[in-house]
Each structure stands twice: as C-alpha cells, then as structure tokens.
C-alpha cells in the first residue's frame, strides 16, 4: 500500500513539475527591465526565451519574437536546449510512468517489469528536474554577470550634453516557476525510484527445510530450496538440490526416526 | 545601434508652420516611445511632445494646441507638426526613441543630432 501511494505520489508530483516546466520555457517573463517613467507612458520590457515584450501603463503590450539565431547570446542558446531536454525527457517519463503505475494493470505484466518502468521513469524525471534547474539558474546567472545593469548614454549633439540612464534587468517570474518545477519534478523523479525499491521481487533463502531420507546411511545435507513470493521465475517452489531432497509439494512426509527438521 | 535622423528645421515667421521629421534607422527590434525635446539658446532641455506605439500622446503646456505629435509606425517615423509659432518657440529641436537594438537588449535612449527652428520676422 505504501509502495502504491509512493509511487502515484511521485507521479502527480512530477506532472506538476513538468507542466511547471513547459509554463516556465513558455512564459515571457524570464527578465524584467526596470524603467523610469518617461514624460509620455511607463513603459514595462520584459523578455523570454523565444520573445521581447513591451507593455505601456496603457495596457498595449507589443510582442516581437526573436527571428534570428544570430545576436543571440549563446548562453540563452544553451538555457533554450535545456529546457527542450527537460521537458521531452519529462514526457517520456510521464508515459513510462503511466505503463509502470501499480494500480494500472495491463495484460500480464509482472511487477518486476514495473519495478523497472518506475526506476526508468524516476530516473528520467531526475534527470529532467536537473535540467530545467541547471536551465533557469545558468539564465540567472547570465542575468547577474552580463545584463544586470546596463548604461545607456545620450547624446544629444550639438548640446554636446551627455546624460546616462542605468535600465536594470531583474529576475522574471518565469525564474522561480522553473526552479520551483524543477525541484517537484527531482522530488518526484526521487520517489519514483523509492517506490521502484518496494515493488521488486524479494526473495529469501530459507536454510531449514524437511529433507526424506532414501536411507539409514544418507547423511543430512544442509542447504534448501529458494522459496519465492509468488513473483519470480520460482513460482511453483520447484526442487532446487536431487538427492533425496523434496519440497512440501513433491512428497508427503511422514514422521520417523529419519526424518530431520 | 539605432540612428535617428531629424529634419524639417529653418527659419520661419511668427504665426507661420513647420513640419519637423524624425526618421529611425539601424539595428531596431523595438521603439515603444519616441518624443520631441528643444533647447533653447542659454538653456536646459524641455519635453514637448511624445507618442507611444500604443498612441498614448502627451504635450508641454506650452505648445498644447498648437503643437500635434504623429508617427509612423511601419517607416519608424516620428513627426511633429508645429502651427501659430512663436519666438520663443526657437530651439535645437532633439528627436528621442526609447528603443531596444535588438529584443534581447534593455530598452535604452536614443537621441538625434538636432534640428535648428528659427521664429523671428
């Protein structure tokens, strides 16, 4: 029951983080530019990954998309290749998920291909947290190291006057839902891969085992039969060791002054 | 790197009208705001006029219906056309955009060269 609960657990958790992801790689709010207000209107620039954005205190917000690769940082290249990589490595899992789910039955499946299913999909839905982190927080850094503050100088000519204005990239909310996605998507990845260790088949060797002795000089062997939950390969507890050894199944023991337990 | 280019300028007499021009040009993705600011001889910058993409228009008192701000948005053009001028109406006329040269680059100020106006009989 903890196994089951474990597991659709870290699914749901994961979706979450998943879905949180594609939002973040989708939202054009990745970095916001503080901006004095001009004499006419505020005006708001933020960017993303794909588009640049501008909103007036009006309310008209004009959008451009980035059509060209070239003039592109090759960090944002790098941040975009990432969460493309966290976000199909996530899908993949949720659907490797699905398949390994234990209160989902499908045909025959043994638990132990499920066991296998759920580390393949935790493993990926690690993987995928990691990179949607490493995607958000390489931007952030990029932000702190080449964009935190840039200065415009004016120049005005004949004037010869110089004014400067320092406009401020800060961190977009896009930021923190990637971090946030991120991290529920490694937690869930993590649970997927606890669940896994309780869905394996256990199996134990049990030492003591009724042997029938074929005579008065057959001396006892130690050893056993590897008794099995019922979800193995072992499943009919077939014999194991010859010589005079029998499982519960195969022979039915009498009492006698043989016979060691 | 965005240019901006004014023209229109000259000497005119008083009560009489210009057409002041403003053309962008270079590397542009964006220009949210473009505005008109003179200088006067002896003197500081003064707004006068500005137009966001979005139409959101705004004057100086001291030109308000006399003055009319328009741009062009498909040739990134910023006009001013000036009627009923007056002396004081002299100045260096500066065109400003408050630009981005490419979308991943803050917005920053732009500013043109100059225009000289010239109001005097």
């Known amino acids: 029951m903890a196994v089951t609960a474990c597991q659709g657990l870290g699914f749901v958790v994961s979706l979450i983080g998943i879905a949180g992801i594609i939002a973040a790689t989708c939202m054009d709010q990745w970095s916001t530019q503080d901006l004095y207000n001009n004499p006419v209107t505020a005006v708001f620039n933020y960017q993303g990954l794909w588009r640049s954005c501008v909103r007036e205190s009006s309310g008209f917000t004009e959008c451009r998309g980035y059509f060209t690769l070239l003039g592109l940082p090759a960090m944002l290249q790098a941040v975009r290749a990432l969460m493309i990589v966290g976000i199909v490595l996530g899908a993949i899992g949720l659907l490797v998920s699905i398949f390994a789910l234990k209160c989902i039955r499908i045909g025959s499946m043994e638990d132990s291909a499920k066991a296998n299913m759920t580390l393949t999909s935790g493993i990926m839905f690690i993987v995928s947290g990691l990179c949607a982190i490493a995607g958000v927080s390489v931007f952030a850094n990029m932000l702190v190291t080449n964009f935190w503050m840039s200065t415009a100088n004016m120049y005005t000519g004949m004037g010869g006057m110089v004014q400067t204005v320092q406009t401020r990239y800060t961190f977009g909310a896009a930021l923190f839902v990637g971090w946030v996605a991120g991290g529920l998507t490694l937690i869930g990845g993590v649970m997927m891969c606890i669940a896994c260790r309780g869905l394996a088949p256990e199996e134990t060797n049990y030492k003591a085992v009724s042997y029938h002795a074929s005579g008065h000089s057959v001396a006892y062997k130690p050893g056993g039969f590897k008794a099995s939950t019922g979800f193995g390969s072992n499943t009919k507890n077939k014999k194991i060791y010859d010589g005079g050894a029998r499982t519960e199944d195969e022979v039915q023991s009498y009492p006698s002054k043989h016979d060691y337990v | 790197q965005v240019q901006l280019v004014e023209s229109g300028g000259g000497l005119v007499q008083p009560g009489g009208s210009l057409r002041l021009s403003c053309a962008a040009s270079g590397s542009i993705f964006s220009i949210p705001v473009m505005t008109w600011y003179r200088q006067a001889p002896g003197k500081g910058l003064e707004f006068v006029a500005g137009i966001s993409k979005g139409g959101t228009s705004n004057y100086a008192d001291s030109v308000k219906g006399r003055f009319t701000i328009s741009r062009d948005n498909s040739k990134n053009t910023l006009y001013l056309q000036m009627n009923s001028l007056r002396a004081e109406d002299t100045a260096v006329y500066y065109c400003?955009?408050?630009?981005?040269?490419?979308?991943?680059?803050?917005?920053?100020?732009?500013w043109g060269q100059g225009t000289l106006v010239t109001v005097s009989s």
């Open positions: 400003n955009a408050q630009a981005s040269s490419f979308g991943w680059m803050p917005l920053s100020d732009y």
